[in-house]
């Protein structure tokens, strides 16, 4: 028998520095977690103690904090090189800055192979990108070899900016021939490493012949055997065992997100490459694990540029940006409109001639808007200003919901109107009329939504049975501010870009902004 230790991360999303327990900015260092300096300490400890160790990343290193905004992926290559990752799969967010934003900072600079078997380049890009990522990699580990085959969510064209010259194929269809090729090379221990979410990970384990282990990402799935060490609730045991169609027991793992945990899986193989046993658990990277001093020093050196960036002008406003709770928790506010417009703009993807865009709607809890921005400071808007408006380090995500769920959400928005509560929704691509004289749960008298399958966008009444795409904060997708119906009834959820980054990019693009209050939210009673 031969034993392999798989260390794995996924959906790190730019958390290079240690974070608080909820993966936001670290405030009290003695209670902070994660970060690459702490991760390195643990990885090195395991490498020294165990003979056959692989360190793998299942994608979405890109996007999530000011580190990515400023360094655009160079920080990912630098620190992953320093940690000596063995391989990485491409995630959807690796395409957020287009193909060039992947090639130059990461693909050309990574000392470790970057993988995806189901992304195929065509046209002029094919020769440019050829060999810069691989479908699979054979890694020598001790006296053996291990094959790693990569995959990426085929939804990436809707979630990021891969352009028109990359084709995202069905994962299972693309993986099988690559696994077969590895078999012909006499590689009999094969790990599928990828970024398509836990449901697809399980399907790959079930359907792709020859895959021994699946290491996944995208769905931020937390798996754990025994009593979990922090706040995350396990979606199942670690590893999650799938019985393949050909009768094998295939371990599937994921390690939550944001570098909070290091996945730790021990696999025992027989001489023919069959998995005999698998066990492990994610390791919580809490403050009991010291930060490596040399990596920490390097982080501090790279940090300097971030502090300078925070005070630079992104663009100008010529109007007061009303982000006060007195406005945004009671009525349409122009800060809410600005943020929603930025959210839609960030999700413009012309992937189908029938649709002007794949999504037209935005909802945003008023309680998530934490500060106004005064235009009487020469109109200047900085990252620092935006961080005061959106201080929680969230993301703006894409969900699919039925019209009936949206109707419930808007009823919830005003079910206890007048108490300055955070659930009052700001909107984009939606016209809503409330009648507060009616009883809670029956106050939405008109709800019109902007069409997507149209050449001239116009507002049509919401259809209860239709499925709509909506951009909203991850806080709402997770049922925050009492929006349990969204969490319970959503049909799909893909995590998006950092909230501040979305708004800052929009302001930089527009240069000068002047959002208005324009009748997106109306009240049909005379008192409003």
């Amino acid at each position: 028998a031969w034993e392999l230790t798989i260390l794995h991360t996924n959906d790190v999303h730019s958390r290079l520095e240690q974070t608080s327990e909820d993966s936001s900015k670290c405030v009290n260092a003695s209670r902070c977690m994660g970060g690459v300096a702490r991760l390195f300490t643990k990885v090195q400890q395991i490498r020294r103690a165990e003979p056959n160790v692989l360190l793998l990343d299942a994608g979405d290193q890109y996007q999530g904090t000011i580190w990515f905004t400023v360094y655009k992926g160079a920080e990912v290559a630098h620190f992953m090189n320093a940690l000596r990752y063995d391989a990485m799969a491409l995630g959807n967010h690796e395409f957020d800055n287009g193909v060039e934003g992947l090639i130059e900072p990461l693909l050309k600079e990574a000392k470790f192979p970057i993988l995806s078997a189901n992304i195929k380049a065509k046209g002029p890009l094919a020769s440019q990108i050829s060999g810069l990522y691989l479908p699979y990699k054979v890694l020598p580990v001790g006296d053996e070899v291990v094959g790693i085959v990569g995959y990426t969510s085929k939804e990436t064209p809707f979630l990021s900016n891969p352009g028109t010259n990359l084709v995202f194929e069905d994962e299972i269809t693309a993986l099988q021939p690559e696994v077969d090729k590895l078999k012909t090379l006499n590689v009999n221990k094969i790990i599928a490493l990828g970024h398509s979410g836990f449901e697809m990970d399980k399907l790959i384990a079930q359907k792709v012949r020859g895959v021994d282990v699946v290491v996944g990402g995208h769905s931020n799935t937390f798996l754990y055997t025994g009593n979990p060490p922090s706040k995350e609730v396990p979606a199942g045991k670690y590893p999650f065992i799938v019985t393949s169609d050909d009768g094998r027991k295939v371990p599937v793992v994921q390690a939550y997100a944001f570098g909070k945990y290091l996945g730790y899986l021990k696999i025992e193989f027989d001489e023919r490459g069959n998995v005999i046993s698998s066990h492990g658990n994610p390791i919580l990277l809490n403050s009991s694990i010291p930060e490596d001093p040399s990596i920490k020093a390097d982080i501090n050196k790279w940090r300097i540029k971030l502090d300078n960036y925070s005070t630079q002008e992104l663009g100008k406003t010529i109007v007061y940006l009303d982000g006060s709770s007195q406005s945004c928790r009671f009525r349409e506010c122009n800060m809410g409109n600005l943020i929603c417009d930025a959210m839609i703009n960030n999700n413009l993807r012309h992937t189908d001639e029938m649709f002007w865009n794949h999504v037209s709607m935005c909802i945003l809890n008023g309680g998530g808007i934490r500060s106004p921005i005064d235009e009487r400071n020469n109109g200047t808007i900085t990252w620092e200003n935006l961080a005061a408006v959106l201080p929680f380090g969230g993301t703006f995500d894409l969900v699919q919901l039925k019209g009936s769920t949206l109707k419930k959400a808007f009823e919830h928005s005003v079910h206890r109107y007048g108490q300055s509560t955070g659930e009052f929704l700001q909107v984009g691509g939606i016209h809503v009329v409330y009648d507060l004289s009616r009883k809670p749960g029956d106050r939405v008298v008109k709800l019109d939504v902007l069409c997507t399958k149209c050449r001239v966008p116009s507002y049509d009444p919401l259809k209860m049975d239709e499925v709509y795409k909506v951009i909203l904060p991850n806080f709402l997708a997770n049922g925050g501010d009492g929006f349990q119906m969204i969490k319970d009834e959503l049909l799909r959820h893909d995590s998006g870009d950092q909230d501040i980054n979305v708004v800052s990019t929009y302001i930089s693009k527009m240069k000068v902004i002047y959002p208005a209050v324009e009748g997106r939210i109306k009240f049909s009673t005379g008192s409003h």
Partner: nanobody, 126 residues
Framework: EVQLVESGGGVVQTGGSLRLSCAAS????????MGWFRQAPGKEREFVAA????????QFADSVKGRFTISRDNAKNTVYLQMNSLKPEDTAVYYC???????????????????WGRGTQVTVSS
Amino acid sequence: EVQLVESGGGVVQTGGSLRLSCAASGRTFTHLAMGWFRQAPGKEREFVAAISNSGAGTQFADSVKGRFTISRDNAKNTVYLQMNSLKPEDTAVYYCAADWGTRDSPSKLNAVYDYWGRGTQVTVSS
């Protein structure tokens, strides 16, 4: 595009020497471990020599030990195979190969190498 281009092959008499070169482009050269393989007519492709990213680690096939040396010039993005005391059984097409990754000891295994050149013919006449 990642490309490997071999040169320096030719016809040489038994006991003679040749120096093969392989120029790499399209990827940071120091991120690649480099190897040489050869294939004689009707035979399997076989490992000859390999060198780690830094140049500190080398590996050789038993059949060429003491006769062949491998080196790299990271400034020129080139790896060299110096072949001395050549024998007729060294006749083959010689392929340059590159392994994306950083390992202290380069691999002898064909499957580990990700990029391949088109080969250069070496003929040792008796």
